[in-house]
């Protein structure tokens, strides 16, 4: 399975949630409705 990181800092391996200690992706709109950067 593809590996990717979850909103609050999880990595998913074969659909198992494993906490990833950083706020990975926080600049990509991981938090629902939180304005990120400016208008692009």
């Amino acid at each position: 399975d593809a590996e990717f990181r979850h909103d609050s800092g999880y990595e998913v391996h074969h659909q198992k949630l494993v906490f990833f200690a950083e706020d990975v992706g926080s600049n990509k709109g991981a938090i629902i409705g939180l304005m990120v950067g400016g208008v692009v």
Partner: antibody
Framework: QVQLVQSGAEVKEPGASVKVSCTGS????????VHWLRQLPEKGLEWIGR????????IYTPKFQDKATLTVDTSTDTAYMELSSLRSEDTAVYYC?????WGQGTLVTVSS | DIVMTQSPLSNPVTPGEPASISCRSS???????????LYWYLQKPGQSPQLLIY???NLASGVPDRFSSSGSGTDFTLKISRVEAEDVGVYYC????????FGQGTKVEIK
């Protein structure tokens, strides 16, 4: 005005599929995650999942894993959510969200 | 799933008076990195929801400072110092420690 514009209301029969669109207006939807949520009539919010438009990677709430398919067409700055095998329990308002912007919601009614 | 439970489900308020809403999670939302993955949203009548507070105590952009949030790992409170007419709607707490789940909502209306 920066906004996300969703497609219009849909009425579908049980067992059918529906595809809801979410287009960025004055906003590049391909830059940030696109989240999809739903709100059942007179009920609370449920998170369906999200897609990273840069690479197409998705994550779903388990109950929607076989129900919803999230895609993005970066050439038109449009995100899509397709719902399959519709049942009456899927009647809800569906929202897309990207960065601080919410779509206006799309009512999907499943009725025979 | 982490279950989010709100109380009360309905909260009649008086303009100018304080108000509070409680939210409890079935699992601690405090991570060892020191962040608490608790959020508050408001859905005003006829509108899409909007983010009020993220990671327990951070005010989202444009949210008036009469809103505040506090809590422990499992028990949280949203406070409005002085309710205004525009604050009516349904308030939801949410978590994203494990995916995203929402509380059932608290309807705030003017008495």
């Amino acid at each position: 005005q920066v906004q996300l514009v969703q497609s219009g209301a849909e009425v579908k029969e049980p067992g059918a599929s529906v595809k809801v669109s979410c287009t960025g207006s004055g906003f590049n939807i391909h830059v940030y995650y696109v989240h999809w949520l739903r709100q059942l009539p007179e009920k609370g919010l449920e998170w369906i999942g999200r897609i990273d438009p840069e690479n197409g990677e998705t994550i779903y709430t388990p109950k929607f894993q076989d129900k919803a398919t999230l895609t993005v067409d970066t050439s038109t700055d449009t995100a899509y959510m397709e719902l399959s095998s519709l049942r009456s329990e899927d009647t809800a308002v569906y929202y897309c969200v990207s960065s601080g912007y919410w779509g206006q919601g799309t009512l999907v009614t499943v009725s025979s | 799933d982490i279950v989010m439970t709100q109380s009360p489900l309905s909260n009649p308020v008086t303009p100018g008076e304080p108000a509070s809403i409680s939210c409890r999670s079935s699992k601690s939302l405090l991570h060892r990195n020191g962040k608490t993955y608790l959020y508050w949203y408001l859905q005003k009548p006829g509108q899409s929801p909007q983010l009020l507070i993220y990671q327990m105590d951070n005010l989202a952009s444009g949210v008036p400072d009469r809103f505040s949030s506090s809590g422990s790992g499992t028990d949280f409170t949203l406070k409005i110092s002085r309710v205004e007419a525009e604050d009516v709607g349904v308030y939801y707490c949410a978590q994203n420690l494990e995916l995203w789940t929402f509380g059932q909502g608290t309807k705030v209306e003017i008495k």
